[in-house]
């Protein structure tokens, strides 16, 4: 109430940029905090199927839009066939997980590995077996699986037949796929993520053309795709809530990614307004319908009148509250390259703590899972990844401060990534793994980097001890 009265903002995220120390939720003087995370804090690590599995056409797997995009757009990359070969070296991934001592492993299911043409008929047996084996092994190790249904590898057949996410037919097809996964894996999975970072799917897939399917400059398609992703997520949430939650007793969310931004002039109302608009246009675009009032942010509705689809009153009611926690991604994919339209002439910043405070203010202090966090190193860096350690310490410190000092309800943290792998438009020019993989080797050994040792210690101590 004080915040509202003093700042003149109705509890929204603009208060974050107020530099009056009495009212800003983030006290910049608390630079480092030696403390532990809450008891039972959920420590994990993640991968994306397309990035690490390899075997892009092995054992009956169908091509994805990314397999196609790699061959048509990324001229210097042969394929993801090499990658870390997680499909072949599952045991090595499990050993890496054992080494770090995580509480959970977040991975994604490759839709075309289960259903080569995307349509749910008889599943590809080898694909089904792979995920089933992985889940059984995790359960055996007491590692909680967090499973993402869609991490960008849409079956190519759905792109070619329907135009992919531009066509609302895909909503029901995605729901069928989700239903199958709930039926087959739901006994072992308590945490589901429907879609990983839909903002990037829409913006880079249809706006900049930097991601598959590589369409450029079609703002109407960007927002149509976003609309269909939100509706697909909502449909799957209702499906899970009605038919599976009663007996499987799990939770389901969608991972939303964002940058953070600071005003050029901290006292300037204009710049603060632009920062708010920047966050709203990226994170708010998806968070508002799902975690907010069920509709797009008002400013977007007004400005994008010719391209932003409209939710009916019934749809708004249906969208609202369709996430059991706020899954948040904060990493390089939302920063490089940053949508200049979203930047609004302000300064990007890696302040995760402030981003978490913004979420708290905008969306009524939800429970938050950091579903992806980390940075990257140049591909030439092998196991001595000091920059990655520095970034991890910085990010984790910010998360700890957010929990201890700002009373933000972060319950888990996903370090990204378990393994070096295929990094989307950057292909193999950067590395994000805590384990080094030589992509040219036969055996693809997972070698722990300094960051793996560091993260292992953080988990063991549950934070930073003096």
């Amino acid at each position: 109430i004080l915040l509202r009265a003093v700042t003149g903002f109705s509890g929204d995220g603009r208060a974050i940029w107020s530099k009056n120390p009495n009212f800003t939720p983030v006290n910049e003087s608390q630079l480092f905090l030696y403390d532990t995370f809450p008891k039972n804090f959920f420590w994990g690590i993640g991968t994306g199927a397309l990035q690490v599995e390899g075997s892009w056409k092995k054992d009956g797997k169908g091509p994805s839009i990314w397999d196609h995009f790699i061959h048509t757009h990324l001229k210097n990359v042969s394929s993801t066939n090499g990658s870390s070969d997680s499909y072949i070296f599952l045991e090595k991934d499990l050993s890496a997980l054992d080494f770090i001592g995580v509480s959970f492993y977040q991975f994604s299911i490759s839709w075309p590995r289960l259903f080569p043409d995307g349509i749910v008929t008889v599943a590809n047996a080898k694909g089904l077996q792979y995920y089933s084996t992985l889940l059984d092994a995790l359960v055996l190790r007491n590692i909680e699986p967090i499973v993402t249904l869609y991490h960008w590898d849409l079956p190519l057949a759905l792109q070619e037949k329907y135009g992919g996410w531009k066509n609302d037919t895909i909503i029901d097809i995605f729901n069928d796929y989700a239903t199958y996964c709930f039926q087959m894996f739901g006994d072992r999975v308590k945490y589901w993520i429907t879609i990983h970072n839909p903002y990037l799917v829409a913006w880079h897939g249809y706006g900049t053309g930097m991601h598959a399917p590589g369409e450029k400059g079609n703002l109407a398609a960007v927002y149509t795709v976003g609309h269909n992703l939100i509706k697909a997520h909502s449909k799957v949430w209702h499906n899970y809530n009605t038919h599976f939650r009663p007996h499987q007793k799990g939770w389901l969310s969608i991972t939303l990614g964002s940058h953070w931004i600071e005003p050029n002039r901290s006292e300037n109302t204009m710049d603060i307004f632009k920062c708010q608009q920047s966050m709203v246009s990226v994170l708010g675009w998806f968070a508002n319908p799902i975690h907010g009032d069920g509709d797009y942010p008002e400013g977007m509705r007004k400005k994008l009148f010719s391209v932003l689809p409209i939710f009916s009153e019934a749809e708004k009611h249906e969208m609202r509250g369709t996430a059991d926690f706020f899954a948040f991604s904060f990493g390089p994919n939302n920063f490089k390259p940053l949508n200049t339209m979203a930047k609004m002439g302000q300064n990007v910043s890696l302040n995760l703590r402030e981003a978490l405070n913004w979420i708290k203010l905008e969306y009524n202090n939800p429970r938050i899972l950091i579903a992806e966090n980390g940075w990257f190193t140049d591909s030439r860096v092998k196991t001595e990844d000091t920059t990655a350690i520095y970034m991890m310490k910085n990010f984790l410190s910010q998360v700890l401060q957010a929990i201890r000092l700002d009373e933000i309800r972060v319950f888990g943290y996903t370090a990204w990534s378990l393994l070096d792998g295929f990094e989307w438009q950057d292909a193999y020019t950067i590395r994000r793994g805590l384990f080094y993989v030589d992509f040219n080797s036969k055996q693809k050994e997972r070698k722990p980097k300094s960051s793996a040792h560091y993260y292992k210690q953080i988990i063991r101590e549950n934070g930073f001890s003096l």
């Epitope: 400059g217 079609n218 703002l219 109407a220 398609a221 109302t269 204009m270 307004f273 608009q277 246009s281 008002e298 400013g299 007004k302 400005k303 994008l304 009148f305 010719s306 391209v307 339209m341 609004m344």
Partner: antibody
Framework: QVQLVQSGAEVKKPGASVKVSCMAS????????INWVRQATGQGPEWMGW????????GYAQNFQGRVTMTRDTSINTAYMELSSLRSEDTAVYYC????????????WGQGTMVTVSS | DIQMTQSPSSLSASVGDRVTITCQAS??????LNWYQQKPGKAPKLLIY???ILETGVPSRFSGSGSGTDFTLTISSLQPEDIATYYC?????????FGQGTRLEIK
Amino acid sequence: QVQLVQSGAEVKKPGASVKVSCMASGYIFTSYDINWVRQATGQGPEWMGWMNPYSGSTGYAQNFQGRVTMTRDTSINTAYMELSSLRSEDTAVYYCAKYNWNYGAFDFWGQGTMVTVSS
Amino acid sequence: DIQMTQSPSSLSASVGDRVTITCQASQDITKYLNWYQQKPGKAPKLLIYDTFILETGVPSRFSGSGSGTDFTLTISSLQPEDIATYYCQQYDNLPLTFGQGTRLEIK
């Protein structure tokens, strides 16, 4: 730099049609809507509608529905506005304007095309 | 349609004066308002968007304020080059509508 260059002045008889062109340069033509606004002498501007150059989709103000058609030719980065069944009250300067999504405003305008409707 | 009413319709001021132009909307438009400057024989030029944000290159003597139905454009110290007609425009609802204009001249 961004430029919108419109076709020259037109004199038309009542009942005829006029087609005004607007050639864009200095930005990616298909990435921003082109809107058309007209202004009669001594009056405030009047919004006529929008056209998305990427898809060709359009939206027209009620006052012009059925009489206006907005099109484009992406190969030459040009937008067109055709107004039919002209009457004397359509005499005005017609402007094309680039719509900036971030602002919710027209950040660049053409120089205007004077259309005179007279018998 | 939302009607935009500007006042005064014309005003005369001296160089260095503080000048205020108001714009009233026929219904609540929150903050979805822009201001344009138009010089004789020229196209309108964007000055301010979202009620108070100055377009790049616009001198800081221009400022905007207001919310709901009442909005103001202020020139803190009038300069000779500010002689023009000023228009407000709402984008809260389609159709987009403009005010009838305020003509500013030097005394």
